[in-house]
């Protein structure tokens, strides 16, 4: 159901395109899977089997207008934010001060973008400036990949396959972001 069979309005499917936008702060209203009441697992996905199909991640979505300075897209767009835990992380207790925290050991599974759509949008600008077209890249699906421990964690492996794809000189980005930085990145990531 949906976009796989319906490619129009100047879109194309682009697998595996580089970096991806982080979730905007507005998505906090969606229930996440990394909650204590679920033991860090999404509901209805207990990960009791080793089946690859059990390793799934959550595709949250958001809607926005594409902006470029004072210019704004004539139509809004929608895309996915890849979220959640991809598998049964092995947890070890660690004491910090009086409390405990948990860290995963073993392979690190990440829910990351799998496919992108290239979308041509028309930007409308104030002050009588002529509209201009711009191509943006929007996340269209997510996938679980395994982050290996080799090469300074620079490789991501497709879950269930052995073929590793080196990521070209990318440094891992810190997860904590301010709302403003997040929004700025979302608006300027294209």
């Amino acid at each position: 159901q949906g976009w796989q069979a319906f490619k129009n309005d100047a879109t194309e499917i682009i697998p595996e395109l580089g970096e991806y936008p982080e979730p905007p702060p507005e998505l906090e209203n969606n229930k996440t899977m990394n909650r204590a009441e679920n033991g860090g697992r999404p509901p209805h996905h207990p990960f009791e089997t080793k089946d690859v199909s059990e390793y799934s991640c959550r595709e949250l979505h958001f809607t926005r207008y594409v902006t470029d300075g004072p210019c704004r897209s004539a139509k809004p767009v929608t895309e996915l934010v890849c979220s959640g835990q991809c598998g049964p992380a092995r947890l070890l207790p660690n004491a910090i001060g009086r409390g405990k925290w948990w860290r995963p050991s073993g392979p690190d599974f990440r829910c990351i973008p799998d496919r992108y759509r290239a979308q041509r949008v028309q930007l409308l600008c104030p002050g009588g400036e002529a509209p201009r077209a711009r191509k943006v890249r929007l996340v269209a699906s997510c996938k679980c990949k395994r982050l290996t421990r080799f090469h300074n964690q620079s490789e991501l492996k497709d879950f269930g396959t052995e073929a590793a794809r080196p990521q070209k000189g990318r440094k891992p980005r810190p997860r904590a972001r301010s709302a403003k930085a997040n929004q700025a990145e979302l608006e300027n990531a294209y």
């Epitope: 949906g2 209203n29 969606n30 809607t63």
Partner: nanobody, 118 residues
Framework: EVQLVESGGGLVQAGGSLRLSCAAS????????MGWFRQAPGKVREVVGS????????YYADSVKGRFTISRDNAKNTMYLQMNSLKPEDTGVYYC???????????WGQGTQVTVSS
């Protein structure tokens, strides 16, 4: 193309509630997400929120979080916008639209007027 028809708008006092409906017909298989948008007089159209049809995952603009709720009825091919604790600044024409994931909202309804009086 997806045909969209909004209904349920009207005049309501501040603090009151309204429920808008958006009925979809036509090539509904081609829509993954449906959204609500609004346009106040003299202002640009803004996002209210949206719902992913497959799993009912919702997204809301900050200005309506906690007051508005989007839901959908698969059997009726209809999306709803429950608006509570309405404010005068919620006044405007409310539109529903449909999109495919990773695309633009290309299919739009004709809009329904919501007026919140103080």
């Amino acid at each position: 193309e997806v045909q969209l028809v909004e209904s349920g708008g009207g005049l309501v006092q501040a603090g009151g509630s309204l429920r808008l409906s958006c009925a979809a017909s036509g090539r509904t298989f081609s829509r993954d997400v449906m959204g609500w948008f609004r346009q106040a007089p003299g202002k640009v159209r803004e996002v209210v929120g949206s719902i992913k049809w497959s799993d009912a995952n919702t997204y809301y603009a900050d200005s309506v979080k906690g007051r508005f709720t989007i839901s959908r009825d698969n059997a009726k091919n209809t999306m709803y916008l429950q608006m509570n604790s309405l404010k005068p600044e919620d006044t405007g024409v409310y539109y529903c639209a449909a999109a495919i994931i990773g695309g633009t909202y290309n299919d739009w309804g004709q809009g329904t007027q919501v007026t919140v009086s103080s």
